[in-house]
């Protein structure tokens, strides 16, 4: 059983990478002297208590920064937020912390990240770029929900 986070880099189909700007993750075209974030991810250790066949439930954080992605409602709208949190603290909890969990599904080289707390809502970036990561229900429209995840060993 893996009990340390794996590291990875993410870009979307338009070759934009995730960058941390003022405690917000944004997707921007890769350029020189740019520092894309390195993702930390670890599978939930209570996988048997979550839905089957929806993907691998994972916690998603920013490597070395003690920041994790979470989903919370603002009004009636599920939103994506970065919270100060140790990913291993989430991993070790006695129950799945669903607000911090995502179903990671892979199809070929493409990965999607669906909120466990808000089924049907996916991590996305606007097709325009330079915009914050969001949660969307609109698949394959104005937003990109497919990402390339490359694991770093």
């Amino acid at each position: 059983k893996i009990d340390t986070p794996q590291r990875g880099s993410i870009q979307d189909i338009n070759h934009r990478v995730w960058v941390l700007q003022d405690q917000t993750l944004i997707a921007v075209p890769r350029k020189d002297r740019m520092s894309p974030v390195t993702i930390a991810l670890i599978s939930c250790r209570h996988v048997e208590t979550l839905e089957k066949d929806r993907g691998n439930p994972i916690y998603l954080g920013l490597n070395g920064l003690n920041l994790c992605l979470m989903c919370a409602k603002v009004g009636d709208q599920p939103t994506l937020q970065l919270k100060e949190k140790d990913i291993m603290d989430l991993y070790n909890q006695p129950e799945p912390v669903k607000s911090f969990l995502f179903y990671h599904s892979q199809s070929g080289r493409n990965s999607t990240f669906e909120s466990v707390a808000f089924p049907g809502w996916f991590i996305a970036v606007s097709s325009e770029g330079g915009c914050p990561l969001i949660l969307t229900q609109e698949l394959g429209k104005a937003n990109t929900t497919d990402f390339g995840l490359t694991m770093l060993f």
């Epitope: 208590t49 603290d89 909890q93 006695p94 129950e95 799945p96």
Partner: antibody, heavy 121, light 109 residues
Framework: EVQLQQSGAELVKPGASVKLSCTAS????????IYWVKQRPEQGLEWIGR????????RYDPKFQGKATLTADTSSNTAFLQLSSLTSEDTAVYYC??????????????WGRGTTLTVSS | QAVVTQESALTTSPGETVTLTCRSS?????????ANWVQEKPDHLFTGLIG???NRAPGVPARFSGSLIGDKAALTITGAQTEDEAIYFC?????????FGGGTKLTVL
């Protein structure tokens, strides 16, 4: 105001089954875990198990596997505990409780007032 | 299965500090047991106090604190008040199941 309203006292014959309910108000049970706990007279608490009402997955203490069945109806915001093949050992007060993550930990933050079950012929 | 043991009864006076403990039959209690503390008052009135060993539940007075002392989980009430008279239960996680202690009856005289 958050509340867990439990069904009324039950007097049941040995060998029968009973289904206890726990109806939530002030929050959506899909957003949390509902735990069930047993308390016998002059004894401590025993964890029966828990349900994730959003997806229906359950965990049971091994001692209650086969004795207890946990279900939930999200449309009525209600969790249920069914107990089968009742004996005098099942005479107790049964509590439901919300086990919720807030800030940095899970807590038992709200409890029902319990349902008294008496098994007697 | 693990057995969780608490003092059966303790007595304190208003304003005093009192510590209740929670021992595991399997060895030292650690942060991996995610100790919870729950208060029971008359008429089946339960309140969650502490989760994850030392995290106070929202709305719980600051006089209640959780910790590990030696090989046990502990609940300390600093400056006990008469309304703290109650039964206190600890609960410890063992992998995927939870085990409660027998409870400590705290009298505040």
């Amino acid at each position: 105001e958050v509340q867990l309203q439990q069904s009324g006292a039950e007097l049941v014959k040995p060998g029968a089954s009973v289904k206890l309910s726990c109806t939530a108000s002030g929050f959506n049970i899909k957003d949390t875990y509902i735990y069930w706990v047993k308390q016998r007279p002059e004894q401590g608490l025993e964890w029966i198990g828990r349900i994730d009402p959003a997806i229906g997955t359950t965990r049971y203490d091994p001692k209650f596997q086969g004795k207890a069945t946990l279900t939930a109806d999200t449309s009525s915001n209600t969790a249920f505990l069914q107990l089968s093949s009742l004996t005098s050992e099942d005479t107790a007060v049964y509590y439901c409780a919300r086990y919720d993550y807030s800030g940095s930990s899970f807590y038992f933050d709200y409890w029902g007032r319990g349902t008294t079950l008496t098994v007697s012929s | 299965q693990a057995v969780v043991t608490q003092e059966s009864a303790l007595t304190t006076s208003p304003g005093e500090t009192v510590t209740l403990t929670c021992r595991s039959s399997t060895g030292a209690v650690t942060t991996s047991n995610y100790a919870n503390w729950v208060q029971e008052k008359p008429d089946h009135l339960f309140t969650g106090l502490i989760g994850g060993t030392n995290n106070r539940a929202p709305g719980v007075p600051a006089r209640f604190s959780g910790s590990l002392i030696g090989d046990k989980a502990a609940l300390t009430i600093t400056g006990a008040q008469t309304e703290d008279e109650a039964i206190y239960f600890c609960a410890l996680w063992y992998s995927n199941h939870l085990v409660f202690g027998g409870g400590t009856k705290l009298t505040v005289l």
